[in-house]
Structure formats: C-alpha cells, structure tokens
Amino acid sequence: MAVTACQGLGFVVSLIGIAGIIAATCMDQWSTQDLYNNPVTAVFNYQGLWRSCVRESSGFTECRGYFTLLGLPAMLQAVRALMIVGIVLGAIGLLVSIFALKCIRIGSMEDSAKANMTLTSGIMFIVSGLCAIAGVSVFANMLVTNFWMSTANMYTGMGGMVQTVQTRYTFGAALFVGWVAGGLTLIGGVMMCIACRGLAPEETNYKAVSYHASGHSVAYKPGGFKASTGFGSNTKNKKIYDGGARTEDEVQSYPSKHDYV
C-alpha cells in the first residue's frame, strides 16, 4: 500500500513539476525591467526565451519574437535547449510511469517490468528536473552578470550634458516557476525510484536448513540467502525480481533507446 502511495504521489508531483516546466518555458517574464532605484517610466519591459514584450501605461502590450536563430546569445540557446530536453524527458517519463503505476493493470505485466519502468521514469524525472533547474540557473546567472555590468555604467553621459538611462533587468516570475517546477520534478523522480525498490523487494529464501539435535554442525545449502541482483545461479526457483538492487550497467543501459533525446 505504501509503495502504491509513494509511486502515485511521485507521479502526481512529477506531473505538476513538468506542467510547471512547460509553463515556465512558455512564459514571457524570464527577465523583467528592474524598477528599484530607477526613474519611473511609463513603459515596462520584460523578456522570455522566445520573445520580448513592452507594456505601456496606456494598456497596450507589444511582443516581438526573436526571429533570428544565429543572432541570439549562446547562453539563451543553451537555456532553451536545457528546458526543451527537460520537457521531452519529463513527457517520456510521464508516459512510461503511467504504465508503471501499480494501480493500473495492463494485460499480464509482471511486477518486475513495472519496477523497471518505475525506475526508468524516476531517473527521467530526476534528469528532467535537473535540466530545468540548470536552465533557469544559467539564465539567472546571466541576468546577475548583466545587472551588475549595467549598474557599473548605468548613466552613460554624452559630454556630461545628456543622460541615457540603461534598462536593467532582474529576475522574472518564470525563473521562480522554473526552480519550483524543477524541484518538484526532481522530488517526484526520487519518489519513483524509492517506490521502485518497494516494488522489487529483496527475496529471502529459507531453504533446506537441517538441524541435527545430536550434533553441533549446521548444514547450509548454497542457495540459501540470495540477493536479487539478476545474476543469481538459482533460476529454477521462484521468479527473481529484476528491479531491486541492480548493477550500474543495467540501470544505465535500460533507457539507452532514448539516447537521441
């Protein structure tokens, strides 16, 4: 029951997280005009990953897309890439995790397969969350750098007569949405990985232990306590779960069919 709850909660948390990552990626307010310690303007500028917008006091808002690809800063391209990879991995993870849910029965799918799928989706959620957090953090770092650079030469005087105030940008709402969403996706992924361990419990076989009342020797047959690593020799006994303590090689090789993402 606890495993089902952990898996279900992990799925829901990841779902909310990925929805948040998608929302953050689409939002226009990644960076917003810094209003602190600046002259009050009748224009408010804000920028997203895909377009920049200007909201006038009049009520009009005008947004213009970044129609160039090569002319954009490499950092912005990197952030876009990280967010998209996060969304794609998260979406695939959601798809896999739906079939992995213990409460959903699909044909005669065994628990070992469900455990594998749960672990796979968990890893995908973790990577997805990390991608989003990394993307948002890279953008935030870019903003901080630009902020202090523009503060250093905030007033660029023309012969000391005319002053041009540079527009400074600060953190927009999308950054906070992205951080929270990335964190939720990460937490959801960890929960899925924990649930996977519960789905594939350690198999303990108490077999053929012979007690001799008269003697002091206890005979243990070699197949007694068996760790379910998937490499066990005792394969003619009960089905061994694959999803428990698996080797690193196995964990990494399973999602290799998604390496093109």
């Epitope: 303007t41 500028n45 006091s57 041009t164 105030v165």
Partner: antibody, heavy 118, light 113 residues
Framework: EVKLVESGGGLVQPGGSLKLSCAAS????????MAWVRQAPRKGPEWVAF????????YYADTVTGRFTISRENAKNTLYLEMSSLRSEDTAMYYC???????????WGQGTLVTVSA | DIVMTQSPSSLTVTAGEKVTMSCKSS????????????LTWYQQKPGQPPKLLIY???TRESGVPDRFTGSGSGTDFTLTISSVQAEDLAVYYC?????????FGAGTKLELK
Amino acid sequence: EVKLVESGGGLVQPGGSLKLSCAASGFGFSDYGMAWVRQAPRKGPEWVAFISNSAYSIYYADTVTGRFTISRENAKNTLYLEMSSLRSEDTAMYYCARLGRGNSFAYWGQGTLVTVSA
Amino acid sequence: DIVMTQSPSSLTVTAGEKVTMSCKSSQSLLNSGNQKNYLTWYQQKPGQPPKLLIYWASTRESGVPDRFTGSGSGTDFTLTISSVQAEDLAVYYCQNNYYYPLTFGAGTKLELK
C-alpha cells in the same frame, strides 16, 4: 466613436475642494489608462495625473501630489479627479484624456474650467 | 523631471512653405525594449483641446495628413510640415511619454505671414 465629457468645474475659493468627473463612451473603458491634463490661460498643457486601466498604477505631477486624487469606476465608465487645498495657480481648463499607443494622449475631452479665486 | 525644449517659440510662414520645428529632451526617450522613442507631437488650435499628430516620434496617427512627418531619436526630434496649409496654423507641442512626470514642451506657434 470615442467620447469624453468632463464635468464638475466651477469657481472655488483658495483652500477649497472640487471633484471633477469624466464620462467615457465609445470604447472599452477598463482596457485603457486615463489621465488628467490641465492648461492654464495662454500656457501650454500640463500633465496632472495618470491612472492605469485597473487602477493598479497611479502617478501625479509634483505640483499636485498630496492635494489631488485620481480614481476611476470602470463599472460606470467614469474617471474622477478630487482636488483639495486649491490654489490660484490651479486655475486652468482641465481635460480628461484617454491614452493610446506610445502612451500618447490619443483622445481628449472638451474640458471643464476650474477657477480658483477669492 | 525631463525638460522638453522646443524651438523656435514661433514661426511665421507662407502657405506652401516647408516648415521644421525642433524638440529636445534632457534625457533619451528611446526604450531599449522595442527600440521606440516615446515622444509625441500635438497640434492645438484656439479654443480646442490638443490633437494627436504623431506618436513614437515618427508614427502618424490615423487621419493625419501625410504632409506631417516626425523624425529623430534619443534626445533630438523634429516635426516637419512639407507644405503648410492655412488650417495648419496652430501651436505645436511635443511631449515626453517615457518618464513620469509626462512633461510637455512650451510649444511652437505657427503663424501666417
């Protein structure tokens, strides 16, 4: 057709109060920022106050800060300017204006005359 | 506050003549976000409220004759009337629409010779 009609002007003594109204029609009142602009006899226009479409942002000219209050009632399509502690230099024609692109004052009313005199 | 300086204060012209008037702001009115200059030109005739002619320094308001042209960027702006008509005799004001307070220039009065 956009129409702005000001009312509430008149003769008032220094230190007195007055409330101007501006009835708007012909456009979505709650979609636009609005402003009050005044023009003293034989002088240029002077911006007095601004209010955003939702009344979230409000700005005043330094000369009227603390004495004038701009407000709006979107349900009634009406803009207000409450004036107190009036001075002789507040004597002017008061216009209500609807903002347009570029924060320009795209539409103006015909104005209401406010005279502050003893 | 942003100071808007208009010159000349008055212009005496003949019909059909080309007229140019200047407006200078104490700070740049160029918004980096959309690369637009938040400067507006108005025309005011006696007994009437001002009428919007040009916004964003160079965008003509609908219904305004194309003989009116706005130009300039940053701090220096110009209003040009290619061929003055009798109905153009009025006072022309420029306005800063970027910084609060939204200040007006003192105006340029266009008079007939």
